[in-house]
């Protein structure tokens, strides 16, 4: 004969668990089912009636099989400077990322709780390191030969042009003026833009403990080579 | 209106039985979810939670006293009674019965009987 | 048995003061942790169920927080009308009230 299959609510055997989507209630000591993501327990079993399930209130979910007296709250409404990734529904709550231009100074479990803008690297800087959704963009002096003239999150310094007769010289904010009317240049001419950081949802961030006070983002900007004062620029 | 109201004898002598009765009003035990609790309070002291039934007939006792008690509900009437045996004078307290939600916690609680455990 | 193990027993504190009172269970109660006023000579009131949620009516200045087995009731200015005994009831495994705590002003 095939072993009965147990309805919930039913006494586990001694030393065995709970199955898939059930729960152990300690006060009925039976086996209960959970609620599905989108509900919460709106009564809890006893030893004679199983679990009752309620629909989540709106802009409150559970994400998970559970048996919570009640749902989560969604997160507050994206700010300004956030693009909402991910909307509140009954089973997942609200996720918030950067807008383009903009990286996470300080996130949470899921998206971001603090964006800060990408520095621009001002003239005679340009970019060591791109940003990134979770990094700030790092600048870095134009080496002698290459120049950066713009004020920009993503350019790098470029090879100053070859002249065959110079008019004038180039420096680090400036590329070298030829008279000759065929200038050569050691790289491909025009401008090099890095590509700006995509916000996308992480699929696996970290929780970040919450500070009591909100951060001042001058403390989140990673130090590169110069200091931030001298290569970066704020909007 | 959710209203609960104790009643039973104000004094009775050491090893007999009290019977305490629960009438509410405002809500069924039919209703599902629903459920009376028993809690009483000696002079002076802190709360303890003696019993509880739920609208399905399921039943709890604290186990340090679940020998000499016995929940019985009366679902046609709105009555919840309690009967407590072998009582003694360390039993002298305030007895409340409460509504507990579908969730496990004493919402409404009614006014309370005093009950005097002497010879 | 979950034992509930509340402090201070009884406290005196000014009028705007802030107050805490805190219940630890002996094992996790998993937030199902519900605060009752109880006023001299009155019947217990419910303030806060599942751990945070106040009931309708309660004033704002109480919140309850907390997870695992270490509870916190907080009433974040003190006023006349708290004077009272304030006591926990963990409801995660059947149900046990803490001893009280009874709050006098100074």
């Known amino acids: 004969l095939p072993a009965q299959v147990a309805f919930t609510p039913y006494a586990p055997e001694p030393g065995s668990t709970c199955r898939l989507r059930e729960y152990y209630d300690q006060t009925a000591q039976m086996c209960c089912s959970k609620c599905s993501p989108g509900q919460h327990a709106k009564v809890f079993c006893t030893k004679t009636s199983d679990t009752v399930c309620d629909s989540c209130e709106d802009s409150t979910y559970t994400q998970l099989w559970n048996w919570v007296p009640e749902c989560l709250s969604c997160g507050s409404r994206c700010s300004s400077d956030q693009v909402e990734t991910q909307a509140c529904t009954r089973e997942q709550n609200r996720i918030c990322t950067c807008r383009p231009g903009w990286y996470c100074a300080l996130s949470k479990q899921e998206g971001c709780r603090l964006c800060a803008p990408l520095r621009k690297c001002r003239p005679g800087f340009g970019v060591a390191r791109p940003g990134t959704e979770t990094s700030d963009v790092v600048c870095k002096p134009c080496a002698p030969g290459t120049f950066s003239n713009t004020t920009s999150s993503t350019d790098i310094c470029r090879p100053h042009q070859i002249c065959n007769v110079v008019a004038i010289p180039g420096n680090a904010s400036m590329d070298a003026v030829c008279t000759s009317t065929s200038p050569t240049r050691s790289m491909a001419p025009g401008a090099v833009h890095l590509p700006q950081p995509v916000s996308t949802r992480s699929q696996h961030t970290q929780p970040t403990p919450e500070p009591s006070t909100a951060p001042s983002t001058s403390f989140l900007l990673p130090m590169g080579p110069s200091p931030p004062a001298e290569g970066s620029t704020g909007d | 209106q959710v209203t609960l109201k104790e009643s039973g004898p104000t004094l009775v002598k050491p090893t007999q039985t009290l019977t305490l009765t629960c009438t509410f009003s405002?809500?069924?035990?039919?209703?599902?979810?629903?459920?009376v609790g028993w809690i009483r309070q000696p002079p002076g002291k802190a709360l303890e939670w003696l019993a509880h039934?739920?609208?399905?007939?399921?039943?709890y006792y604290n186990p340090a006293l679940k020998s000499r008690l016995t929940i019985t509900k009366d679902t046609s009437k709105n009555q919840v009674v309690l009967t407590m045996t072998n009582m003694d004078p360390v039993d002298t307290a305030t007895y409340y019965c409460?509504?507990?939600?579908?969730?496990?916690?004493?919402?409404?609680w009614g006014q309370g009987t005093t009950v005097t455990v002497s010879s | 048995d979950i034992q509930m193990t509340q402090s201070p027993s009884s406290l005196s504190a000014s009028v705007g003061d802030r107050v805490t009172i805190t219940c630890k269970a002996s094992?996790?109660?998993?937030?199902?942790i519900a605060w009752y006023q109880q006023k001299p000579g009155k019947v217990p009131k419910l303030l806060i169920h599942?751990?945070?949620t106040l009931q309708p009516g309660v004033p704002s200045r109480f919140s309850g927080s907390g997870s695992g087995s270490d509870y916190t009731l907080t009433i974040s200015s003190l006023q006349p009308e708290d004077v009272a005994t304030y006591y926990c009831?963990?409801?995660?495994?059947?149900?046990?009230f803490g001893g009280g705590t009874k709050v006098e002003i100074k």
């Open positions: 409460a509504r507990m939600t579908g969730t496990r916690y004493f919402d409404v």
């Open positions: 405002g809500f069924s035990l039919s209703t599902l979810g629903m459920g």
């Open positions: 599942y751990t945070s």
């Open positions: 094992q996790n109660i998993n937030k199902f």
């Open positions: 039934i739920w609208w399905d007939a399921d039943k």
């Open positions: 009831l963990q409801y995660g495994v059947l149900w046990t």
